[in-house]
């Protein structure tokens, strides 16, 4: 279809003002999913920078899908006249930040982080490995970015950018990824292999982000982390295609080439990694 063949031109900072996304899923393309229902839904279009209508098939898809235009605007637009900034000039936290810590019904002893609304801080807890709720982050940094207030009355957002309380502008934060490349795959691809806590010796693969290859390791059968794949192909599909070469401060170079969508499950949402 046309999406597969479209030409991706280089977009640099000078061509468009930087897009200030409130949530990373607002950047996802509208996805009608594989089912055949005809349901009117709304998505945020990063090109027009507006919420628009689309037809949803009724299953799967992604998080850039809203029941109403108002809900879409609330989640994805930064309309200064009708900001979601509280009177304290802080960006509103997602609802799930206020959910209590939930280890879930399984017991895998996995270290995760949650936002404690009593202490107003992100804290460590032991996650069981299944179910639970969305107040559950792989890293302390991710939890702080999404749920904690910054030191100067700003809310840190998902893109490693801060909403400045004074002029309502976005200030980019430093990233640990080398400047030549930007990683757009799942965050767990950057974590080290983790054998886990049990005593089995299962053959698994992990993505070694230093050498950029999938390597075998022995998995204990429980615990560990998400950089854990049953086959090398699965590992490569999920992680290898996540690096995009940067060519300028804000532009990504993308080659004109047929690409297929590869669905990757990440924590509580589905993201799409484009095969380069």
């Amino acid at each position: 279809d046309s999406e597969e063949d479209e030409e991706h031109t280089i977009i640099t900072d000078t061509e468009l003002p930087p897009l200030k996304l409130m949530h990373s899923f607002c950047a996802f393309k509208a996805d009608d999913g594989p089912c055949k229902a005809i349901m009117k839904r709304f998505f945020f279009n990063i090109f027009t920078r507006q919420c628009e209508e689309f037809i949803y098939g009724g299953c799967e898809g992604n998080q850039n899908r809203f029941e109403s235009l108002e809900e879409c605007k609330k989640m994805c637009t930064r309309d200064n006249a009708n900001r979601i900034i509280k009177t304290t000039l802080q960006q509103e936290k997602p609802d799930f930040c206020f959910l209590e810590e939930d280890p879930g019904i399984c017991r895998g002893y996995i270290t995760r982080y949650f936002y404690n609304n009593q202490t107003k801080q992100c804290e460590r807890f032991k996650y069981g490995g299944c179910l639970g709720n969305m107040n559950n982050f792989e890293t302390l940094e991710e939890c702080k970015n999404i749920c904690e207030d910054g030191p100067n009355g700003f809310q840190v957002d998902n893109y490693g950018t801060q909403l400045n309380a004074v002029n309502n502008s976005l200030t980019p934060q430093s990233t640990k990824v080398p400047s030549l490349f930007e990683f757009h795959g799942p965050s767990w691809c950057l974590t080290p292999a983790d054998r886990g806590l049990c005593r089995a010796n299962e053959n698994r693969f992990y993505y070694n982000s230093v050498i950029g290859k999938c390597r075998p390791f022995k998995y204990s059968g429980c615990g560990g982390n998400e950089n854990n794949f049953t086959s090398k192909q699965e590992c490569l599909r999920a992680c290898k295609k996540g690096f995009i070469q940067r060519i300028s401060k804000g532009g990504l170079i993308k080659t004109k080439r047929k690409r297929k969508k590869q669905r990757v499950k990440i924590a509580y949402e589905e993201i799409f990694v484009k095969n380069m």
Partner: antibody
Framework: QVQLQQSGPGLVKPSQTLSLTCAIS??????????WSWIRQSPGRGLEWLGI?????????RYAVSVKSRITINPDTSKNQFSLQLNSVTPEDTAVYYC?????????????WGQGTLVTVSS | DIVMTQSPLSLPVTPGEPASISCRSS???????????LNWYLQKPGQSPQLLIY???NRASGVPDRFSGSGSGTDFTLKISRVEAEDVGVYYC?????????FGQGTKVEIK
């Protein structure tokens, strides 16, 4: 060997409260390696999960949205049992009700079930 | 809710022959740590369900090795290598990827 023994009335009138109890032997309702659930089965709906409780650092519960406004699952640690209360029942709630243990450690699944109680909602 | 769809709904089998049941989920169940959040249960006539396969492919204790589970993503299969008379009943798949926990509608296995 874990055993779950269900008890409670088999007939409930519409608008009344359905109450069932599940007595546990061979495990503890407060165990941090288990969770305790109610599931019902009817010809129209098949197996339908209703809710679950579990003790970790504290007690947690989760309920199916379809019954959330009407359901309560409570542990009774003194009697080592847990109960189901479903308020404002209608004939749609007629089903065989099962209590089940979710194995939280290695075997993540409902590995032990009660014998089932047929509850009929009728005046 | 995640919808679990099984096929076939009825499966007449011959003892000693293999049998296969399919289960499809409306969204991917393979998530963290290489774990598949899918179980299989068998409900024999007049009995409560019993756990057969957990985490997609692991046999529960006491389950004969003629039962095997496989699959990933949204497509899963339960196989019986050689059906025995005691295997008759209704087989259910169940997901625990997200609340509410949901079951397939069941596949009734009966002897021809």
């Amino acid at each position: 060997q874990v055993q779950l023994q269900q008890s409670g009335p088999g007939l409930v009138k519409p608008s009344q409260t359905l109450s069932l109890t599940c007595a546990i032997s061979g495990d503890s309702v407060s165990s941090n390696s288990a969770a305790w659930s109610w599931i019902r089965q009817s010809p129209g709906r098949g197996l339908e999960w209703l809710g679950i409780i579990y003790k970790r650092s504290k007690w947690y519960n989760r309920y199916a949205v379809s019954v959330k406004s009407r359901i309560t699952i409570n542990p009774d640690t003194s009697k080592n049992q847990f109960s189901l209360q479903l308020n404002s029942v209608t004939p749609e709630d007629t089903a065989v009700y099962y209590c089940a243990r979710w194995h939280s450690d290695k075997m993540w699944g409902f590995d032990d079930w009660g014998q089932g109680t047929l509850v009929t909602v009728s005046s | 809710d995640i919808v679990m769809t099984q096929s076939p709904l009825s499966l007449p089998v011959t003892p000693g022959e293999p049998a296969s049941i399919s289960c499809r989920s409306s969204q991917s169940l393979v998530m963290s740590f290489g774990i598949t959040y899918l179980n299989w249960y068998l409900q024999k006539p007049g009995q409560s369900p019993q756990l057969l396969i957990y985490k997609g492919s692991n046999r529960a204790s006491g389950v004969p090795d003629r039962f095997s589970g496989s699959g990933s993503g949204t497509d899963f299969t339960l196989k019986i290598s050689r059906v025995e008379a005691e295997d008759v009943g209704v087989y259910y798949c169940q997901q625990y990827d997200s609340y509410p926990l949901t079951f397939g509608q069941g596949t009734k296995v009966e002897i021809k």
